[in-house]
Interface confidence: low
């Protein structure tokens, strides 16, 4: 479902590279000329998820059964129990606590698996390249299991997965087949199993963009199960705008608003831009170009 967005990510990445743009995800539609600086509870490190669906709210569905299930709570960053009604719902639903942890928590990253060559690598080395849903494109490295090499890719700045390294060397050390095989101790020092940041600890640069709004703003538009054709709006987190879609009249998810205004109110304020020291970069839409000096590189933030 959410993985169908990957081509869109790739398209955005190429567009941004061609235009030399680092677009601001807060860019709501042009009629809304506002500045947004969001300050939220920042004690925890930026949350990066192994799978986008881990950000979905627990959804018991419309049916009336009482089934014990587990979901990943993005606020507590833990797998928690909920009661599932037995039908519909979403992908953030697991039969067991273990399955939930395996899919959504980074504790699982500390499990070491054996490759066919009997060399040990962390599970995340086998995850596909994932730029995430944001658009603050920065260069990162991932292990390509097809070529068995670490390669460069453009990371959007939020979400994505753990196959994401700041340096080529770091990626090689953790995921490539070295002369002495994979060193468990090296890996242990690279990653902190306590926090749920889902990034290598040695990655000193936090996400350029983080999402702090309601989790359903991250979900794709869902027509639902019925046959009506109602005009609704959903928040497209890839482009940071509210877009129309046809709702069937039942089912679907919470990313479903009767008006564009309501959609914008609910979702557009959720993005913040971060700088390395935990400060904020204000994104003003009035300015054509805003030069933003960041500790690790200089980029241009320009509205699309």
């Amino acid at each position: 479902m959410i993985y169908t967005m990957k081509k869109v990510h790739a398209l955005w990445a190429s567009v941004c590279l061609l235009l030399n743009l680092a677009p601001a995800p807060l860019n709501a539609d042009s009629e809304e000329d506002e500045e947004h600086t969001i300050i939220t509870d920042t004690e925890l490190p930026p949350l990066k998820l192994m799978h986008s669906f881990c950000a979905f709210k627990a959804d018991d569905g419309p049916c009336k059964a009482i089934m014990k299930r587990f979901f990943f709570n993005i606020f507590t960053r833990q797998c928690e129990e909920f009661i599932y009604g037995g039908c519909e719902g979403n992908q953030n639903r697991f039969e067991s606590l273990e399955e939930c942890k395996k899919m959504c928590t980074r504790d699982n990253a500390n499990r070491i698996i054996k490759t066919t060559l009997q060399q040990e690598k962390p599970d995340f080395c086998f995850l596909e390249e994932d730029p995430g849903i944001c658009r603050g494109y920065i260069t990162r490295y991932f292990y390509n299991n097809q070529t068995k090499q670490c390669e460069r890719f453009k990371y959007g700045g939020c979400l994505g997965n753990m196959n994401n390294f700041e340096t080529l060397e770091e990626c090689k050390n953790i995921c490539e087949d070295g002369p002495n095989g994979f060193q468990v101790d090296n890996y242990g020092t690279q990653l902190n199993a306590v926090n749920n940041s889902l990034t290598p600890q040695s990655t000193k640069v936090p996400s350029l963009f983080e999402f702090h709004g309601p989790s359903w703003c991250l979900t794709p538009a869902d027509r639902g199960l019925c046959r009506a054709n109602e005009n609704r709006f959903y928040y497209n987190s890839v482009i940071g705008k509210c877009r129309p879609f046809k709702y069937s009249g039942c089912g679907g998810n919470e990313n479903n608003f009767t008006s564009k205004q309501e959609c914008l109110r609910a979702c557009k304020k959720g993005f913040i831009q971060r700088i390395s020291k935990g400060g904020l970069i204000k994104t003003k839409r009035k300015r054509k170009k805003q030069r933003v000096k960041i500790a690790y590189e200089e980029i241009f933030v320009k509205n699309m």
Epitope: E32, D33, E34, E35, H36, T37, I38, I39, T40, D41, K57, A58, N73, I74, F75, T76, G213, P214, Q261, E262, R265, A266, C267, K269, K286
Partner: antibody, heavy 120, light 107 residues
């Protein structure tokens, strides 16, 4: 009818803590965020933070971070605000407030307020 | 933080007069402003949402206008029950902030 019923006035000593409660009725408690607002005597209103009763997720005004802790008890549809290490600056009326629609951050439904007086 | 400046601090009116309250934001906030009335010893009450949208149950004599940085709440014919403090609040960005208020009193 939507109602927010807050706990009664509190007289506490400096350095102590207090827990203000807000019992919600007339709507599905977990469907809407609960906000807390401070009003010092003769002064304006300040947003403290909010809690999503569904998940327990919170967001605080940086000014009140560390001072206020927001929690909920879903079984009784009650929101709580715990204020610690109180000083005279914390003497105020505290309101629990429910938003009109999800995440729209306009304050449609207000509790009657709880007066907290910090005095030796 | 977005600073909301309300003026004047006190407004003296006679019943039946039209009165306007001003609220100015330190930066553009679109129409993300809401107006509240607070009578003595009472809780605030929402009067106008999103700068100009009316609220059910609120008398039609209350209206709002403005966008960007300048906003106005108007009462087209003041009644004695309108004597209260009036506050604006922005929901454009966190932290949510309120103006210092304008006190409406009878001449």
């Amino acid at each position: 009818e939507i109602q927010l019923q807050q706990s009664g006035p509190e007289l506490v000593k400096p350095g102590a803590s207090v827990k203000v409660s807000c019992k919600a009725s007339g709507y599905s408690f977990t469907d809407y965020n609960m906000y807390w607002v401070k009003q010092s005597h003769g002064k304006s209103l300040e947003w403290i933070g909010y809690i999503d009763p569904y998940s327990g997720g919170t967001s605080y005004n940086q000014k009140f971070k560390g001072e206020a802790t927001l929690t909920v008890d879903k079984s009784s549809s009650t929101a709580f605000m715990h204020l610690n290490s109180l000083t005279s600056e914390d003497s105020a009326v505290y309101y629990c407030v429910r938003e009109g629609n999800r995440y729209d951050e306009r304050f449609t439904y207000w509790g009657q307020g709880t007066l907290v007086t910090v005095s030796a | 933080d977005i600073l909301l400046t309300q003026s004047p601090a006190i407004l003296s009116v006679s019943p039946g007069e039209r009165v306007s309250f001003s609220c100015r934001a330190s930066q553009s906030i679109g129409t993300s402003i809401h107006w509240y009335q607070q009578r003595t010893n009472g809780s605030p009450r929402l009067l106008i949402k999103y700068a100009s949208e009316s609220i059910s149950g609120i008398p039609s004599r209350f209206s709002g206008s403005g966008s960007g940085t300048d906003f106005t709440l108007s009462i087209n014919s003041v009644e004695s029950e309108d004597i209260a403090d009036y506050y604006c609040q922005q929901s454009s960005s966190w932290p949510l902030t309120f103006g210092a208020g304008t006190k409406l009193e009878l001449k």
